[in-house]
Every structure is written in C-alpha cells, then in structure tokens.
C-alpha cells in the first residue's frame, strides 16, 4: 500500500490521543533505554510503511502483536485516514485471526514495540519538520 495520500495530521492526532498510550501501557515496567532502536524512517509514507509492517507482519521472534489493542487502533486509524487502505488489508485480517491467542508478552515483543515507538516518534518529528 502507498501511504502517500494519507491524512497525516489526523493520523498524528489519533496516535497522540490513543495509540501512544496503548504502546506505553504495553511497555509498562520497561525503560525506553532497555532496547536499542535499529530501524528508523525518513518521511511520513516511509514511517507508516514500516509501522504497518512491524505491527501486522508476524516475525519468528514475536508472532502476536496484531491482536494487541494498539495494533487494532493502528489498523482502524490507517483505514480511516488512508484512502483505499482497508481494501488492501483482507489478507492481513486473516493473519490477525490466526495469530496466537496467548497473552504472554515476550522480551522480543517488548523489543519490537520499542522499535514501533521509535518509528511513531520519527513520524511525528517528520510531520513537524514539514510544517
């Protein structure tokens, strides 16, 4: 999906209002310095591309982020403010349904969410630089 035509201001507002709080709740008890951020993004479409991939694509080390509250809200936000996004997400929805129901938060998932926080912060910063 090409995120170029999203309403970035609206996505920022949704992130600051709800998604950020859910990400921080998921990370509760973990210091932001516990993990080294190894990926970043350079502009708004790039940031959303990487956020989408890291949130919804299961990885060998962390297969279960897609069913978390912040992921559901991220999906809703992208569907709301990115034209045509929801039509591209049928396969992703199936992947979410197949995701393990276990609520165990592994260290690797914490690390992945730490990376997500970094990508979202970069998204906000790139937004500020464009204004």
């Amino acid at each position: 999906y090409d995120f170029t035509n999203c309403d970035f201001q609206k996505i920022e507002a949704d992130y600051l209002r709800t998604i950020s709080k859910d990400l921080i709740t998921y990370m509760s008890g973990t210091k932001s310095t516990d993990f080294n951020n190894t990926v970043s993004c350079s502009n708004r479409p790039h940031c959303l591309t990487e956020i989408q991939s890291l949130t919804f694509n299961p990885t060998p080390r962390c297969a279960s982020l897609a069913k978390e509250m912040f992921a559901r809200k991220t999906k809703a936000t992208l569907a709301l403010w990115c034209p045509g996004y929801s039509e591209t997400q049928i396969n992703a929805t199936q992947a979410m349904k197949k995701a393990r129901k276990s609520k165990v938060t592994t260290n690797k998932c914490l690390e992945q969410v730490s990376q997500l926080l970094g990508l979202w912060r970069r998204f906000i910063r790139t937004l500020l630089k464009k204004q």
């Epitope: 190894t38 350079s42 790039h46 890291l54 990885t59 990376q115």
Partner: antibody, heavy 117, light 108 residues
C-alpha cells in the same frame, strides 16, 4: 562486530538473472536493522538497490523495482539479491550493507559482477 | 527525484591543510544527509549522519554542517589516510535514496 561478505558469480550473461548472497556474522539479521544492497559501476558513484528489514519488509529503488528481489534466509543468517534481465549497464561492484533504513553503517567488501556474453 | 551535487570534483591539498567539501540537494532535505569515505579498492565507510553527527569510531577532525539544501564536510587537518573519495547521501526522499557523484581529495 558485524561482518558482511558478498558471494556469487563474477560473470553473468546479458538477459540472465544476477544472483548474489550476503553472509552476515556477528549479528542476527532477524534481531534488528535492515539489510541492503548498493552497487557501484566501475569508476562511478553509488546507487542504492534496496533493503529487507529484520521484520521482513522490503523497499526497492523505483528505477530498478521491476527487476529486483531481495529475500533472506534467517536460518543461514544471510540475505540475497536477484536482478533479472541484466545488461552491460548492470556491471558493477555490488555491496551488501547493514542499514537503519536511512543510511548505511556497515559494509561488505564488495564483489565485482560483469555482464558480458 | 532529489539530485545531489558535490563540489569540487577534485580537491588538491597537502597534509595538515583544511578540507572543505560541499554537497547540494536539488530540494530541501532537512538534516537527512550522510557522508561516506571510500578508499581505492575498499567499501565506503560512514563518517557523518543526520548532517552533523559523527559516527562512532570516526576521528574528531571530521565534522559536518548544513541543513535544507546546502551541506559541508570539513576535515580540520588532513592526515595521510584521509586522501580518498567522499560521497554524500540523502535519505529524505524514501524510496529514492541518492548519492552525490563524489569528491576526490588528492595529495597536492
């Protein structure tokens, strides 16, 4: 200390597919970063080809996108480049590199690929 | 596409002299710029990222400055091992990361 090592045929015929592999040691490619390919034609500048992130997302240079595939094998801790329908213009030193998806922090030593019949 | 233009193409200096290399972007890229050094037969090495941040392990004689469209790499006092080709790279315009054509710093 991460180390990267490119390998693959040094000679490819026109219209065939160029295939290269980058073996990574000292860091797991599924633990972090992105894993990129960059090339440099003889005596010329650098051109970014694309990357695959540690979580599997890929991004390609739009000018090469229709011909490029980057994949990975986490069990062998390596990633690969396939470039189809090559011509003499694809003759270059090909580098693999570790990236944070912005700039390129660690590089392999490079491998020269010549496209010729 | 953002085009990166480096000048001069060649810089002839003596060890101990100050080197000033320029990189210009065809449109604004904020501070999304990196500098690399490449010696003959070797891979490039990252020197500077985000226009002015020194990569770990790089000597302090290297410094970067600039924002928007105009950027500078400065080597305060050239050492013999600094004679090489230097490239700038912009990463503002994903997925079109682009490099400058290079500046060769040679011994006068």
């Amino acid at each position: 200390q991460v180390q990267l090592q490119e390998s693959g045929p040094g000679l490819v015929k026109p219209s065939e597919t160029l295939s290269l592999t980058c073996a990574v040691s000292g860091y797991s490619i599924s633990s972090g970063y992105g894993w990129s390919w960059i090339r440099q034609p003889p005596g010329k500048g650098l051109e970014w080809i694309g990357y695959i992130s540690y979580y599997g997302s890929t991004s390609y240079n739009p000018s090469l996108k229709s011909r490029v595939t980057i994949s990975r094998d986490t069990s062998k801790n390596q990633f690969s480049l396939k470039l189809s329908s090559v011509t003499a213009a694809d003759t270059a030193v090909y580098y693999c590199a570790r990236t944070n998806l912005l700039y390129f922090e660690s590089w392999g030593q490079g491998t020269l690929v010549t496209v010729s019949s | 596409e953002i085009v990166m233009t480096q000048s001069p193409a060649t810089l002839s200096l003596s060890p101990g002299e100050r080197a000033t290399l320029s990189c210009r972007a065809s449109q604004g890229i904020s501070s999304y710029l990196a500098w690399y050094q490449q010696k003959p037969g070797q891979a490039p090495r990252l020197l500077i990222y985000d226009a002015s941040n020194l990569q770990s392990g790089i000597p302090a004689r290297f410094s970067g400055s600039g924002s928007g469209t105009d950027f500078t790499l400065t080597i305060s006092s050239l050492e013999p091992e600094d004679f090489a080709v230097y490239y700038c790279q912009q990463y503002s315009n994903w997925p079109q990361y682009s490099f400058g054509q290079g500046t060769k710093v040679e011994i006068k």
